[in-house]
Interface confidence: medium
């Protein structure tokens, strides 16, 4: 296993609508012809995963339907969005890259991204 | 776990066609991207064309207009036409399967083009 350096954005805001978008980049030592991404989400220092998509390279990002991330693909970078987000989602959610093939294998882990999540306040009731 | 079963390679002449089948089983609803890969006699191995659940597809350069991936969800398979067929595309072909747990190969099956 070889190191690979990842880099994402340190801080998103989702928007009212619950969607948080952001880009993870790798920095790809070889020409990789299968691609494995994973984001993880740390909160209270427990470590979940949130969605895992393996593409291949020149080939969209297609994550699993009942996937809540949704995402594409362009050389080196991967353009994420997490769907859905409530303000209890908050936290830090990491980008995880790994070549798979052909042989050597890397892996990458980026510094995170924090997500902040706030409820939309519900509308006032009207009179009219 | 997914296994993967081609068939369909044998012996043809230059310009010749065949037609590659990789039959999925177990886990397939877990599988997003298939490809064929293929291993020339002494060389490693070479990503030949890919397709995703949604159909999008992509070829390596030595083979676009000529071989053409496709995929049948109804059926499980992925397939490969292969048409001008060339001496150098001579080799074993792999079936690969992709998805959020799953990575598969299939176990090969010999094309030998040859007059």
């Known amino acids: 296993c070889k190191a690979m350096h990842v880099a994402q954005p340190a801080v998103v805001l989702a928007s009212s609508r619950g969607i948080a978008s952001f880009v993870c980049e790798y920095a790809s030592p070889g020409k990789a012809t299968e691609v494995r991404v994973t984001v993880l989400r740390q909160a209270d220092s427990q470590v979940t995963e949130v969605c895992a998509a393996t593409y291949m390279m020149g080939n969209e990002l297609t994550f699993l339907d009942d996937s809540i991330c949704t995402g594409t693909s362009s050389g080196n970078q991967v353009n994420l969005t997490i769907q859905g987000l409530r303000a209890m989602d908050t936290g830090l959610y990491i980008c995880k890259v790994e070549l798979m093939y052909p042989p050597p294998y890397y892996l990458g882990i980026g510094n995170g991204t924090q997500i902040y999540v706030i409820d939309p306040e519900p509308c006032p009731d009207s009179d009219f | 776990e997914v296994q993967l079963l081609e068939s369909g390679g044998g012996l043809v002449q230059p310009g010749g066609s065949l037609r590659l089948s990789c039959a999925a089983s177990g886990s397939i609803f877990s599988i997003n991207h298939m490809a064929w890969y293929r291993q020339a006699p002494g060389k490693g191995l070479e990503l030949v064309a890919g397709?995703?659940?949604?159909?999008?597809?992509n070829y390596v350069d030595s083979v676009k207009g000529r071989f053409t991936i496709s995929r049948d969800n109804s059926k499980n398979t992925l397939y490969l036409q292969m048409n001008s067929l060339r001496a150098e595309d001579t080799a074993v072909y792999y079936c690969r399967a992709l998805g959020g747990a799953v990575a598969a190969w299939g176990q090969g099956t010999l094309v030998t083009v040859s007059s």
């Open positions: 397709v995703n659940s949604r159909g999008t597809t």
